[in-house]
Amino acid sequence: SGVFQLQLQEFINERGVLASGRPCEPGCRTFFRVCLKHFQAVVSPGPCTFGTVSTPVLGTNSFAVRDDSSGGGRNPLQLPFNFTWPGTFSLIIEAWHAPGDDLRPEALPPDALISKIAIQGSLAVGQNWLLDEQTSTLTRLRYSYRVICSDNYYGDNCSRLCKKRNDHFGHYVCQPDGNLSCLPGWTGEYCQQPICLSGCHEQNGYCSKPAECLCRPGWQGRLCNECIPHNGCRHGTCSTPWQCTCDEGWGGLFCDQDLNYCTHHSPCKNGATCSNSGQRSYTCTCRPGYTGVDCELELSECDSNPCRNGGSCKDQEDGYHCLCPPGYYGLHCEHSTLSCADSPCFNGGSCRERNQGANYACECPPNFTGSNCEKKVDRCTSNPCANGGQCLNRGPSRMCRCRPGFTGTYCELHVSDCARNPCAHGGTCHDLENGLMCTCPAGFSGRRCEVRTSIDACASSPCFNRATCYTDLSTDTFVCNCPYGFVGSRCEFPVGLPPSFPW
C-alpha cells in the first residue's frame, strides 16, 4: 500500500486558448484531471487502473500552484494504491477550462479541454521528487512526482507491513526496509524478550522487563550469582544451593560448633596465650603476674619477691614498695650501706672493699650467688643440656641425662650408630643424620645385610678347558668338573698322558 504523489508547480497558457485554438471567455479558468494506470508502451484511453484525482480551479491562463491545499483540493495530489507497487506506471494529466462551477465531466462541453499530456516509465519507491516539464504548441506544464509507502508499509514496493508496538506482543519500531528494530532493553525475533540486568546469571536469573534480574529458587544477590545456603547454616557457605560448607574453625552439620574459640572470642586477657582444646573449650597460659581461667586476675606484685637483702614488700595501688632492713637502700633494697667490716657475705663468700670502703662486693663460692651470696645456684636454669637432654641438680654440680643417640657432658655428642658394627656379613656402615645405612657385599641384602641372596658363582665362567661349572648353593662357590686330561680347581693344568701299550 502506498501513495503516488503529483505536485503541480506551474501552468503556462499565455494566449488563454483551448486545445481547439478558441479563446476562453473572459479567460481560461483552469483545473486538472489526473489518471494513473498500469504501464502501457503507448498510453491509450481506458480505465485508470491505479486511480484518478481532480483539482478545483487553480488559476486563470498562466499561474503557479501553491504546494498546499487550495480551494478544498490538495497539492501535492494524492493517488493512493492498495497493492504492491509494480515499479512502472502510465500518467495522463489533462488541463480543463471551467466556464461554470460544475466541474463534473458530464457538465463540461467537450471542447473545454485546454491540454493533455501522457507519460510512462519506471519509478522506484522513494522520498525524492522527479521533476518534469511537458510543452505543447500553446501550453507548458511543470510538475514533479514520487511514490511513497503508506504508514506502516515498507520495502522497495511497499509490500512489507510493519506497525510499531510497545506491548506484550513486541517492543519495536520499523526500519526503512520494514525490518523490526527493538526498543532499548528488548531482543528476540519480535522483540518480546527483555534484556536482563547486565551480568544477571544466565541460568540462575531471569527477567520480565529490561534491566531486571529475578533469581530462581536457591539463588540470591543482585546478579543471582550467590547460592542460598541450607536453612540454619550459621558459619558456612555454599557453591550450589542448600549446601552448608563450614568456614575455617567451625564444625557440625550447620557449622554452629566453634572449633576455634580462641580466634572467634579471644577469651584470654592480659596478653595470655590461648589454646583451643575442643568444641567451645580453650586454655589460657598466663603471663607472669596474672592468674585465673582467663588470666583476668592480677597477682600481687609482691608475690615475685622483688625486695632483696631481706627487704619486706608492701603492695600499693600503683605497684609495690620495699621496706629495707638496716644497712640497705634502693628500690629493691639492692644497695648496701654496709662495709666488709659488717661481714655482709653469707655462705662463705669473700668480701672485697670498693670505693675506698664506701661499698663492697661479695665473691661467692660455687653453688651460691646474689649480691650477698644469699641465693643457692640452680645450675639447670640456663638449660645447659643440648639435644633435648634432661638437666639434673646433683648437690654442688649438675649432670645431663641424654636422649638415645647422644652422649657427652652436655649431650652435645652424636653417638655413632655404626659403633655397634650393626652391618652383618662384612657390610660397610655409614652414619646418617637420622640413623645408619649398610652397604652389603655381593650375596647379601636387607637393612643390616642379614639376608643371604643366592648368586650364580658360575656366571663369570671360572672353569677352563671346557670343564663343567656347578654352583655350591651352601657356600655360594663354584666347582669345576674337569674333562679327561685336566686337573686343578679350575681344570687349568693338563695331565701327562699315559704311555701307549703295544697290544
Epitope: 541450607h230 549446601q243 564444625g251
Partner: nanobody, 120 residues
Framework: EVQLVESGGGLVQPGGSLRLSCAAS????????IGWFRQAPGKEPEGISC????????YYTDSVKGRFTISRDNAKNTVYLQMNSLKPEDTAVYYC?????????????TGQGTQVTVSS
C-alpha cells in the same frame, strides 16, 4: 547420583523409642560423615547428631545427649539413630545429611525426611 533415604519414623508415645535408618547410595559410603538434623514446623533446623566416616567421632546436641545414639554399618551403607525416652518436643521431620567429606562439618546432600511424632 547421591541418594539418602530415611525410614523408621512414626507416631510414638512420650517415653517411647524409635530407630531411624538412613540408607545411602551413589558415593563411597566409608569416605563420608553422616548426620541427622530435624525441623519442627515454623522452626529453624537443628543439627542433632553426626558420625564421622570412620565412626570414631560422634557428636550430639545438648538436648538429645544421653537419649539418642548414632551408629553406622559401613557394610550396609546405613546410618542409624536410636532414639530413647522420646519427648513431645522431639516431634519434627528428621533428615539424614552428609557434608560430602569425612568430618562432621556442614551439609552437602540431604534426604527427603521422615516424620517423627511424639504424642499421647
Amino acid at each position: 547420583e547421591v541418594q539418602l533415604v530415611e525410614s523408621g519414623g512414626g507416631l510414638v508415645q512420650p517415653g517411647g523409642s524409635l530407630r531411624l535408618s538412613c540408607a545411602a547410595s551413589g558415593f563411597t559410603f566409608d569416605d563420608y560423615a553422616i548426620g541427622w538434623f530435624r525441623q519442627a514446623p515454623g522452626k529453624e533446623p537443628e543439627g542433632i547428631s553426626c558420625i564421622s566416616s570412620s565412626g570414631g567421632i560422634t557428636y550430639y546436641t545438648d538436648s538429645v545427649k544421653g537419649r539418642f545414639t548414632i551408629s553406622r554399618d559401613n557394610a550396609k551403607n546405613t546410618v542409624y539413630l536410636q532414639m530413647n525416652s522420646l519427648k513431645p518436643e522431639d516431634t519434627a521431620v528428621y533428615y539424614c545429611a552428609t557434608p560430602g567429606i569425612a568430618a562432621c562439618r556442614g551439609i552437602h546432600y540431604t534426604g527427603q525426611g521422615t516424620q517423627v511424632t511424639v504424642s499421647s
